[in-house]
Amino acid sequence: ESALITQQDLAPQQRAAPQQKRSSPSEGLCPPGHHISEDGRDCISCKYGQDYSTHWNDLLFCLRCTRCDSGEVELSPCTTTRNTVCQCEEGTFREEDSPEMCRKCRTGCPRGMVKVGDCTPWSDIECVHKESGTKHSGEVPAVEETVTSSPGTPASPCSLSG
């Protein structure tokens, strides 16, 4: 039995913390979808649709499920082992530098620019200068003409909210 698993096979980060007085390193953690009881003896299930845990843990409580905000759609519900996956509604996007809210995508590019990327749940439309091909970022000046386009359809889920 060359690949026999023993206590020694556990990587240091997989072993229970030394300050936890438990009988064996393998018994100090609870599996995904659970948290540990206060006395450290039992594993207690997270509540389906209410909270979750994604990794082996010694948490005293599971993590609260994310509730999708208005302006977001729920791509997949919260289970005991996975948080809710929320995505910005069509026509809106979430930027890395402002992940707390979905922002409206621009409806078109400024004059002298051409659209090369659609609105997605994780990015605004992408505009480049017709001649130079350099990207333009920032708001569309109110006085300039814009080339309008309809928002693109989502291709894949964006990051979790919350």
Epitope: T6, L10, A11, Q14, S26, P31, S45, K47, T80, T81
Partner: antibody, heavy 119, light 107 residues
């Protein structure tokens, strides 16, 4: 298709030990916990504990802590449970089971191994 | 440990009848209840989990309900092949525990 194939019937003497096996197939062996369940003749079901092949994490029901020892062999996708110091109370059918991702209910069951302890 | 009590060890019914098998937990198990069917000489088979979710391939005449401490497995129209032992199990807290079983007999 998920399958759990258990070893055959065992007739053992009191005081001896026996090692049962549960060979898993049809899924990634290291991603799911294997549980063991005891059923005495004409009686209910008792959860013995779990073994997680991914890292060797074990959880025993306190009642079976001094009775059962779980190990695994990743190369053959097999989990083992050794029962020691056998008495007539250990005569039972032992099942290995596998849960699904979102809860520790037994979605898949082995066919069971009958252990008879008799002099 | 959480005790799961199935008050009826036996239940007698006729083909086509509606039957309800009950299970009571000694404490709130937050709907983390599964139901199994076991026929003689076979391994148990999962019917219901999370109190009311039907497992793949289970006929829709089997339904689960309940919350807190009280749970029920209902067979809406009993068939001859439903003659079996039925167990509830809490998958809320270790050690996971099973009810004593209810044997469904056909009149």
């Amino acid at each position: 298709k998920v399958q759990l194939q258990q070893s055959g019937t065992e007739l053992v003497k009191p005081g001896a030990s026996v090692k049962l096996s549960c060979k898993a197939s049809g899924y990634t062996f290291t991603e799911y916990i294997i549980h063991w369940v005891k059923q005495r003749s004409g009686q209910g079901l008792e959860w013995i504990g779990w073994f997680y092949p991914g890292s060797g994490y074990i959880k025993y029901n306190e009642k079976f802590k001094d009775k059962a020892t779980m190990t695994a062999d990743k190369s053959s996708s097999t989990v083992y449970m050794e029962l020691s110091r056998l008495t007539s109370e250990d005569s039972a059918v032992y099942f290995c089971t596998r849960h699904e991702e979102d809860g520790y209910y037994a979605a898949y069951w082995g066919q069971g191994t009958l252990v008879t302890v008799s002099a | 440990d959480i005790v799961m009590t199935q008050s009826h060890k036996f239940m007698s019914t006729s083909v086509g009848d509606r039957v309800s098998i009950t299970c009571k937990a000694s404490q709130d198990v937050s709907s983390a209840v599964a139901w199994y069917q076991q026929k003689p000489g076979q391994s148990p088979k999962l019917l219901i989990y999370w109190a009311s979710t039907r497992h793949t391939g289970v006929p829709d005449r089997f339904t689960g309900s309940g919350s807190g401490t009280d749970y029920t497995l209902t067979i809406s129209s009993v068939q001859a092949e439903d003659l079996a032992l039925y167990y509830c199990q809490q998958h809320y807290s270790t050690p996971y525990t099973f009810g004593g079983g209810t044997k469904l007999e056909i009149k």
